[in-house]
Structure formats: C-alpha cells, structure tokens
C-alpha cells in the first residue's frame, strides 16, 4: 500500500487551525458539535436565502516539503435546496475548490485572483430535511489531486456561492512508496511522482549477505503516482553460506552448508565430512576422504578404491586372458576405471622390463571399464607379470595405489596361423605365420600331415622357412595338416588341424 504523508488535517487539529474566512463572520464559520463527549469541528455556511453569495474559506499556509503531487480529501455534507422553501432560486448544492502556490505565507492578506480552481465539488448524496432533523446527515467524501507543485507552500480555498455546506474534514497529503523489502532487496521510501503515466525507477540494495546472482539483473522497482510499487525487476539471492529466512539471509547452521548464491536452502553436510561451523560454504572432508574437482559440494566425500578383488591370468599359448572382479570398497564412487601394465622377465638372466611396446591388448589398457582384457603377442618362455590398478575420481589426490598382480610363464609359442597357398592333384602348398616377436626363438617348423581317416601313419617335414610344398600325394584326397614351431626349449603350440584336399585328375587341367 502507498504511504500517505499528511500535510494538513483539519479534523485532527481540533479547531485550532484558525482558517481565514472572507467576508469575516458572514459566510463560512467554524462550528463545534459534541459527539460521544468529543468535540467535532466543522466549517459551515448556509446563506441559501440570500442571492449573490461569494464566501471564501482559506486554509493556513501549508509547507510543501518534498511533495510533488498533493491529494485533497474532503468530507462534507450538503443540504437539499428543497429544504428551503422559496430559496430554490439562489440556493446551490455545490462549492468550489481552489489552490494557490506561494513561497511565503501571506497571512491575512487574501487575494482571490491568486487562486486557481481545482474543481467544482458536488455531493453524491444530499441531506434532505427529514434526514437533517433526524440527525442522519449524509457524509460525502471527495478526493482531488494537484501537481506538480513547485513553490515552497500552498493554500487551499473553498468558495461558497450559496449552498448549505458543512466541511467536516480536509486532509491534504502526498504519497510515498513505502520502504520495502522484496526479493531480498531493500527499496527506500520514495516520493511518488507527479505525472500519472510516469513511473519512477528505484534501485534496490541487496540485504546483508545477499548478492545479485552472476548474470542476473540488479533489483529495481517502479514507484507509481499512487504510492504503489510496481514492476519488480531482478532480485538478490542469499550468498554462499546463507539461506533465506523471511526477508533476510541467515547463516547456515552448524552442520549445514550452502556453496553458492542460490534460492536453495542450506543443505546438511554430506557423509564423510567434518561438522561445519556456522555460515559454511562447504563441508571439509574427513581424513582419508576427498572431493574431486568436479564433485558437487553436496556429494559425500569419497576415497580411492581398494585393489581389484580377484585377478586371474589364464595363458593360451602366446596369449593371456586377464580377468578380475571389482574392488570390495569402491570408495563411495561409481567412476572406477582400471589400468593394466605388463612386465616381462627373461628366465635365463632374471632381467625384467616393461613390455607395453611388444604386446598387444584387446582394448586400450588404460581407463578400462570392463573387468577383463586379452594380452597377445607374448614371447614364449618368458615370465610376465601383469598389474591391474583400480582408480576413481579421487585417486589422483593420493600417492598410494590400489592394485593387484598376476604372473604367468609363456612356455610355448603361439600356434602358427596356417593358409593353403596352392594345390594340384598330387601336391599341397602350405604357408604359416607367427607373431614377429616370437620368430627369433623358433629353430624350425615341423609340418605333420596324413590322409584323413588314416590314423595309423603320418608324415613329418621340417623346414626353417614359412612354407612348404607337400608332394607325392594322392589325387582327390583330403589331408589333415598341422604346423608346430620348434624352439631350443622344445615344441611350441601346434596350429589347429586343417583339412586340405588335392585336386581330382579331371580338374587338373583347370
């Protein structure tokens, strides 16, 4: 609601104001009535039977102060002209309201020409004879406004031209938009402007411990002519460590926190944090618990995971399948990843070194989310140690690591990959390959072949190369062929048994 600042209140003055009447004593005059043992004062005039009335009542000089537009509230009664037989010709039922601005009080020097008419004041209800005699007078309330005012003060004047009027209340006030707290912003008491369409823009100030949020608009409101605040723009939010309680920002209670300026309340400190003091913006982690840079302050503090729970390394020739189970303690996080590292040791010398460059992983060995990986291209007769480390978002904040190791000895080369290169009615040309790292340890390759279905006899050919042509074979016959590498330490893993068929004599020409 608009705040009214009263400049003049006749009814409240108890007849003490001593307004000027002109002509003196013949027109307007002060009267007193007693109601409920209290004196009620009014200025009245009722010279309805005489024509040519021009009676003036002028207020005392009113200091304008900061007012720009004044509001004039009048409470008055007007008697019905029909109450006065024969007086209808000169009787009126209205009076006129005037004002004059001045920089000084003219005292008793009253000059009508200085006054400007505001309006003719007409009653909504007139008091008829029966009501008047029954003491049921009809009280009218009218309000007018004047502005903008520019001089130090002003007078109001009431001109009677032959009515029967009693003026019970004259209240002159101006309007202010009252001091206001809204959106955690304080808006000062502001004088309402004088022009109806205009709105005075007023900047607000954030209350203690409140701020304009980043990218937000500064709080502003508009003070209308009627003293009402309109069109709020922007707002303030309680800063980190404070929450909104009614129209203020109150420090978070111990054990609670708020990490940013927002509308949200303080939150209870999450798990694995120390009790916070009053006004905390975050809750410190317990010893051994951490927060990753990207973790919200509302998230519990966490710790690195324990080692992978169970790790197996299953050798398959020159391959190893590593399998493990997740850590028993995830550290309170779900962002666990695994890293696999490899170390190889030469049995003869006992010398060891990293083997990342010489082995091949089924998927990149760092940042694994699955719990298995296959490592191939392993060298035969070598000892391998595989380390699987579990990490999460806070592992980088500690120096210790959580890992488990598994060792495996590769006693055989990887089985050769065999291909049929060519064939005739009596021969088969076969080639094979093994991973380059293993080739240096191979002494010879042994090719074993026999007719399919004949389990009693087989033939063996040895060669240092990667191919062989098997001759003196029967036409149109299926042979079972296997290739095995021979090393200084013994036999390597055999290839799988392949079935190759010689050509039939009819098709030999093709």
């Amino acid at each position: 609601q608009g705040k009214e600042v009263v400049l003049l209140d006749f009814a409240a003055a108890g007849g003490e104001l001593g307004w000027l009447t002109h002509p003196y004593g013949k027109g307007w005059d002060l009267m007193q009535n007693i109601m409920n043992d209290m004196p009620i004062y009014m200025y009245s005039v009722c010279n309805v039977m005489s024509g040519d009335q021009d009676n003036w009542l002028r207020t005392n000089w009113v200091y304008r102060g900061e007012a720009e537009r004044i509001f004039i509230e009048l409470k008055f009664t007007v008697r019905d002209c029909n109450s006065f037989p024969g007086g209808a010709s000169s009787c009126k039922e209205t009076f006129n309201l005037y004002y004059a601005e001045s920089d000084l009080d003219y005292g008793t020097n009253f000059q009508k020409r200085l006054f400007t008419k505001i309006d003719t004041i007409a009653p909504d209800e007139i008091t008829v004879s029966s009501d008047f005699e029954a003491r049921h007078v009809k009280l009218n309330v009218e309000e007018r406004s004047v502005g903008p005012l520019t001089r130090k003060g002003f007078y109001l004047a009431f001109q009677d031209i032959g009515a029967c009027v009693a003026l019970l209340s004259v209240r002159v006030y101006y309007k202010k938009c009252p001091e206001l707290l809204q959106g955690l912003a304080h808006f000062p008491e502001t004088i309402a402007g004088s022009d109806a369409p205009s709105l005075a823009t007023v900047a607000g100030t954030c209350v203690d411990h409140a701020v304009v949020p980043p990218g937000g608009e500064e709080p502003r409101m508009h003070c209308a002519v009627d003293g009402e605040w309109l069109v709020p723009i922007g707002q303030c939010l309680c800063q980190a460590g404070y929450e909104k309680v009614e129209d203020a920002c109150q420090a978070c209670s111990p054990g609670f926190f708020k990490f940013e300026a927002s509308e949200s309340p303080c939150l209870e400190c999450p798990e694995h944090t120390l009790p916070s003091p009053e006004g905390a913006t975050s809750c410190e982690c317990e010893e051994g618990f951490f927060r990753a840079p990207q973790d919200p302050a509302s998230m519990p503090c966490t710790r690195p995971p324990s080692a992978p729970h169970y790790l197996t390394a299953v050798g398959m020739g020159a391959k190893v399948e590593l399998r493990w189970t997740p850590p028993q303690d995830s550290g309170g996080r779900e962002d666990i990843v695994y890293s696999v590292t490899c170390e190889q040791c030469w049995p003869e010398s006992g010398e060891c070194g990293p083997c990342e460059a010489s082995v091949r992983y089924s998927e990149p060995p760092h940042g694994l989310t699955r719990t298995s990986v296959t490592v191939s291209d392993l060298e035969p007769h070598m000892n391998y140690t595989f380390t699987v480390e579990a990490r999460n978002g806070v592992s980088g904040l500690v120096t210790s690591r959580s890992f488990r190791t598994a060792s495996v000895s590769i006693n055989q080369t990887e089985p050769p990959k065999v291909r049929l290169e060519g064939r005739s009615t009596t021969s088969l040309s076969v080639s094979w390959s093994i991973p380059p790292p293993q080739q240096s340890r191979v002494w010879k390759y042994e090719v074993t072949y026999r007719k399919k279905g004949d389990s009693n006899s087989y033939n063996v050919r040895r060669t240092e190369g990667f191919s062989v042509t098997l001759d003196d074979l029967a036409p149109d016959t299926t042979y079972l062929v296997q290739v095995q590498a021979l090393t200084q330490e013994g036999q390597g893993a055999g290839s799988k048994v392949h079935e190759f068929q010689t050509l039939s004599p009819e098709g030999s020409g093709n």
């Epitope: 003196y24 004593g25 013949k26 005059d29 309805v48 005489s50």
Partner: antibody
C-alpha cells in the same frame, strides 16, 4: 479561572464618547473572536460588533456602524469598544463575550456588564 | 427577515416539563443557541449546536430543532430556573452577523 472583567462605563452626554475595556484571563485570548452585546434597560439582548482573533477583521450592526470601533490588544489580553457620537438609544448595559468557536459563537464566556448612560 | 420570535412568558409548576420555542427563517440554516439570564447578571450559555451542553449545565436542559423552529426544554423545572431565556442564531439573511430572540420570561409557580 476563565473570566472577562469589564470597565469604563458611565454617564455621557449625547454626541459624547466613551471607551469600554474588557480584560481577559484564564484562556488564550488571541485564539478567540470577541463580541460586544448590549441590553437596553428591560429589553432584549442586541448584538453590537465582533473582532477576529488577530484583530484584522471586524463587523458591526447597522445601528452602530461608523460610530463605534472595536479593537483588541492581544499582548495585554484586552478588548476595547470606542463609542463616539453617542445617542440616547445607545443607553444600555454593554457585555463583552467570547465566541467559543469561529466568529459567531456561541458566546460561552461573558463579562459582568457595564452600564453606559447617554443623557443630557 | 432576521428576527427570532419567542413567547414573552411561560410558566411551569416545579418538577414539570416546560418548552420554550424560538421561530425564525435563520433556524432552517443554523442551529440556535440558548442563554439564561437572571436579573442583574450576564447571560449564561445553556445549549448550542445540535443539542450540546457546556460543562456545568444541568442535564434537565435540552434543545431540539425542526424547520424554522428551535426549542428549549426543561424537564423537571426547579425554582432556580426562573429567569429570562434568549435564543440566538447566525443570521442567514446577511443583514446581521448574529441575532437574538425577543426573550421569554419563565416563571416557576409556587
């Protein structure tokens, strides 16, 4: 207590002059309009004149207009009535009276009265 | 006219009620005031406005008005009420500022 004390009456020849005084006490004299009312022997009350609280405004009954002058000295809390060109019909008891509100009364405080006799 | 007319005299037995009237055009516009005057003393205000009594005036005195008439009523008249009574009103004709009635002599019998 609140009172008005009058002085200055007496016998005067027709055409003569007389000045009546009315000393106020017990109230803020400068806040009230003051009147003179007279009463011929055995007759009704007759309003004579009024002066505004600040002394700037006066009004007279037609019967005394131009002959009588009302004045006041607020610093002395005193009201005066200067009567010139007195006539036999001006013979009366003269009362000063306070208008309790406004210019026209009612008259809530009265002086004790002073007799003015105009006779040759 | 600006005259206020009153009956010259009225009498009442002690303890009885008596009404003194006042007639005049001004009374349509303005309330009457009533004054009591005992021989050799100044008038005393009894009633003003709608029906207001100054402090010290007994409540047996009351006033009323209707149209061009105003009335002073004494309910339960007492011997000490024997006096002259004057009505008074602002003058609505503009001829005078204020006018007094012709006065009424109240006699309390016995």
């Amino acid at each position: 207590q609140v009172q008005l004390v009058q002085s200055g009456g007496g016998l005067v020849q027709p055409g003569g002059s007389l000045r009546l005084s009315c000393a106020a006490s017990g109230f803020t004299f400068s806040s009230y309009a003051m009147h003179w009312v007279r009463q011929a022997p055995g007759k009704l009350l007759e309003w004579v004149t009024v002066i505004s609280p600040d002394g700037h405004n006066t009004y007279y009954a037609d019967s005394v207009k131009g002959r009588f002058t009302i004045s006041r000295d607020n610093s002395k809390n005193t009201l005066y009535l200067q009567m010139n060109s007195l006539r036999a019909e001006d013979t009366a008891v003269y009362y000063c009276a306070r208008a309790s509100v406004g210019a026209t009364g009612p008259f809530d405080i009265w002086g004790q009265g002073t007799l003015v006799t105009v006779s040759s | 006219s600006s005259e206020l007319t009153q009956p010259p005299s009225v009498s009442v037995a002690p303890g009885q009620t008596v009404t003194i009237t006042c007639q005049g055009d001004s009374l349509r516009s303005y309330y009457a005031s009533w004054y009591q005057q005992k021989p050799g003393t100044a008038p005393k205000l009894l009633i003003y406005g709608e029906n207001n009594r100054p402090s010290g005036v007994p409540d047996r005195f009351s006033g009323s008005s209707s149209g061009t008439s105003a009335s002073l009523t004494i309910t339960g008249a007492q011997a000490e009420d024997e006096a002259d009574y004057y009505c008074n009103s602002r003058d609505s004709s503009g001829t005078h500022l204020t006018v007094f009635g012709l006065g009424t002599k109240l006699t309390v019998l016995g």
